[in-house]
């Protein structure tokens, strides 16, 4: 069961896996959640009754019964991992810890104007896990305003001590705030010849890449496939690092694949969720349980529901045996990966889906779309919402996109003359406007947040957030779209679609059925030539056919320009403005969402 509250002055006895240092019990709980085996923890807060060397210790614990005996102890704070919970989990920690020195390898020292600048530096440095900043009140003159970037093998401090006039904090890479490049490519027939920090077994290069991504020290990896000549190294995933942050040597080797940590793009692609099945593959590990199951899908469900299960192997039933049920072997290991992978024994293996909640919901695969045709089908664009105004009468006002369970991203120009958020209604999971009746459920709008530099659509900053009064429960017909990664600024999107209920020609009316059009992106240089009277800035993105014919139009405003990249849909643009609709050599102009990721995160993550 899910227990989120912390138990004050309580210590769990026994079950120790390892001890790390964390600045707070809250962060200890996050570390426990992300650890492959931790189910419970005990944190020791600073206290005069405690030995200072034990302050800030976070003892990660495991238990076959999922609980441990409780003992009263002053300054101890205990709790459970969020593994047992169904809610979305994030490792993002924006907290700044005053008068704490988080120890690690100090590999970079520089002057910074503020702790925020130091944190930004850490976030944009490939090696940095956390930092300590000496404030201008720090006693030692030569250390004032010094920003120390630090890393450790575990990503958590090796020790934490009290130190006046310093502040410490963590890299915000896991908050999607890094400007580091997001390199998704996997390079075939390539070995990166750099130092290995760890090695695990993986069924394919994609899983290896995901493991590298959530390993604190891994910057890139090499994977030896099952056809690799050296049998003992088959399915071996080597996690690597280098001083420069890049591979120093690439060696051409057949049957090996290499790639990079996806740390800078982890909010927009799945890195924890290994959802594939591996046929004719057996995962070896510590056996947790053997249960009968009808199929490998049922076996995966059983593993997902067993909190300690990390991976499984299913052996299909022999004909007419055991009512057609096969054997489902639920397994675990010290690091969450199989200890060995065997092929050719007829098993079907896979991983728990419990970790999927650590990934952004927006990375979930949606149903295959119908190609061709202009009318959408239900569930094809589950992030698309219709924003209605009730003034003078209820009607579709603009489109919008679900980007979080309480947040809609749309265009600022939609709110001209809207005096209050109360008069707005957001409908999600809608295909036809005619579905919306008086009793159709909607989300009320609590707040309209318009970019403070917005003046008019044509001059940019045409972006707004709607904070909903209640949260959206994600389903197949209503779920979020990923924001583009700042590290993806140079990605060339080739599969982009604009959707909306807007006009189909300049003098028309709102369409009943959600319309879709595949539209190519146009370079800003090309777009600028088509709009000589306007300034097309880097904060705008253009899309359209040279000959016209397909475009967004009145009523589509605020809706998404959705682009598919590496099987994940990204909100690349917000429908903003254009000269007429679908005119020859007049592309549509969209708000370039990647340029506003910081603004979006600042507003949506504000306490």
């Amino acid at each position: 069961e899910c227990v989120t509250q912390l138990l004050k002055d309580t210590c769990f006895e026994g079950g120790d896996i390892t001890t790390v240092f964390t600045p707070s019990a809250k962060y200890c709980q996050v570390v426990c959640t992300y650890h492959p085996r931790c189910l419970l923890f005990t944190f020791t807060a600073e206290s005069p009754s405690e030995d200072p060397t034990r302050w800030f210790t976070c003892v990660l614990k495991d238990s076959v019964t999922e609980t441990l005996p409780r003992v009263n102890r002053t300054a101890a704070i205990s709790g459970y991992s969020f593994k047992q919970c169904s809610h979305q989990i994030s490792a993002c920690n924006k907290d700044i810890y005053v008068d704490l020195d988080m120890k690690g390898i100090n590999y970079n020292s520089s002057v910074a104007k503020s702790a925020q600048e130091c944190q930004e530096r850490c976030t944009d440095d490939v090696h940095c896990h956390f930092f300590t900043y000496a404030t201008r009140q720090f006693p030692s003159l030569e250390h004032r305003n010094i920003c120390l970037l630090k890393h450790t093998q575990t990503g958590t401090p090796t020790r934490i001590t009290k130190l006046d006039k310093v502040v410490s904090g963590f890299s915000l890479k896991s908050c999607a705030l890094s400007n580091l490049a997001c390199i998704r490519d996997i390079f075939p027939n390539t070995v990166f010849a750099d130092s290995n920090i760890d090695s695990v077994m993986a069924p394919d290069a994609f899983v290896c890449g995901r493991i590298c991504t959530h390993h604190p020290g891994c910057l890139f990896f090499t994977f030896f496939s099952q056809e690799w000549p050296k049998e003992s190294q088959r399915n071996l995933c080597l996690l690597k690092t280098s001083e420069s942050g890049l591979p120093s040597t690439r060696i051409k080797k057949s049957k090996a694949l290499s790639g990079f940590s996806l740390q800078s793009c982890r909010h927009s692609i799945p890195v924890f969720c290994h959802s594939s099945f591996y046929h004719d593959t057996d995962f070896l590990g510590e056996e947790l349980d053997i249960v009968a199951a009808k199929s490998h899908e049922a076996c995966q469900k059983l593993c997902t529901n067993a909190v300690r299960c990390q991976f499984f192997t299913y052996t299909p039933a022999q004909a007419s045996c055991n009512e057609g049920k096969g054997k489902c072997y639920l397994k675990l290991s010290s690091n969450g990966s199989p200890t060995k992978i065997l092929h050719g024994r007829g098993g079907i293996s896979g991983y728990t889906l419990r970790l999927c909640k650590m990934d952004n919901e927006c990375t979930t695969k949606i149903k295959p779309r119908i190609v061709g045709g202009t009318a959408s089908v239900r569930g094809e664009w589950p992030w698309q919402v219709t924003l209605h105004t009730t003034s003078p009468t209820q009607r579709h006002l603009c489109g919008g996109s679900i980007i979080g369970n309480q947040w809609i991203l749309t265009a600022a120009h939609c709110f001209y003359g809207v005096e209050s958020p109360k008069i707005l209604r957001v409908y999600s999971g809608i295909l036809n406007q005619s579905e919306i009746k008086e009793d159709t459920s909607f989300f009320g709008v609590q707040e309209i947040i318009i970019h403070d530099q917005y003046k008019m659509a044509e001059s940019g900053y045409d972006i707004a957030l709607l904070k909903l009064e209640t949260t959206v429960n994600y389903t197949d017909s209503q779920r979020p779209i990923c924001l583009p990664s700042k590290g993806d600024r140079n990605v060339i999107y080739t599969d982009c679609w604009v959707t909306g209920w807007g006009y189909r020609k300049l003098r028309d009316k709102i369409q009943n059925t959600l319309q879709k059009a595949k539209i190519p992106l146009v370079t800003n240089e090309e777009c600028q030539k088509r709009y000589r009277g306007h300034k097309i800035t880097h904060k705008m993105i253009c899309a359209g056919y040279r000959e016209g014919g397909k475009d967004a139009c009145k009523g589509d405003s605020g809706g998404p320009l959705s682009c598919k990249h590496n099987e994940v849909w990204h909100l690349v643009g917000i429908t903003s403005w254009g000269e007429g609709c679908a005119q020859r050599e007049r592309p549509g102009v969209y708000t370039n969402v990647v340029e506003y990721v910081d603004w979006i995160l600042e507003k949506t993550q504000a306490v």
């Epitope: 003034s391 003078p392 009468t393 009607r395 209050s420 958020p421 008069i423 709102i510």
Partner: antibody, heavy 117, light 107 residues
Framework: QVQLVQSGSELKKPGASVKLSCKAS????????MHWVRQAPGQGLEWIGN????????NYDEKFRTRVTLTADTSTSTAYMELSSLRSEDTAVYYC??????????WGQGTTVTVSS | DIVMTQSPSSLSASVGDRVTITCKAS??????VSWFQQKPGQAPKLLIY???NRYTGVPDRFSGSGSGTDFTLTISSLQAEDVATYHC?????????FGQGTKLEIK
Amino acid sequence: QVQLVQSGSELKKPGASVKLSCKASGYTFTRYWMHWVRQAPGQGLEWIGNIYPDSDSTNYDEKFRTRVTLTADTSTSTAYMELSSLRSEDTAVYYCTRMGFYAMDYWGQGTTVTVSS
Amino acid sequence: DIVMTQSPSSLSASVGDRVTITCKASENVVTYVSWFQQKPGQAPKLLIYGASNRYTGVPDRFSGSGSGTDFTLTISSLQAEDVATYHCGQSYSYPLTFGQGTKLEIK
């Protein structure tokens, strides 16, 4: 069922003010715009303005902007219309009407206001 | 302001007749037009909304059509109880405006 009950007839002198009430029941008062419309003897309908009780957002016809104040009391689900500086041409039946999902679907019975010296 | 011009201002027809009342908007109001029936001494009642949607409980002899600037209310077979004044109104933009009304009588 939805009901809009308006206050009784008023006889006023020119220059005076009048405040009419409209008590709503049978629906969530805060979630619908309340409009006010008047009809002079033998004439058509004339829109005065509207109010959204949940936020006190209002819109007025320019003709009435300086003389009309629309308010709403959510605790009693009552909308009010105050018209000041009355003149003889303000003699009319004043209706409150709820803007339903797409149109003015429920109307009060009307309040007759007579302005005469 | 959008001007709604209703015609005729009055008409007389026999029971069973097909009756048509038109309303012309001075600019495009899409389909944001409603029709109301008002009997003497009573408040108006909604008949048609969204130009062509019959309101709950309204007999199916009443129908509406049109979009843009030209709208029509049709009574397919006039009944004695249909004697009333009929108003069209637009709710496309502020200020909301109404036609001057059409008074319908039985011959």
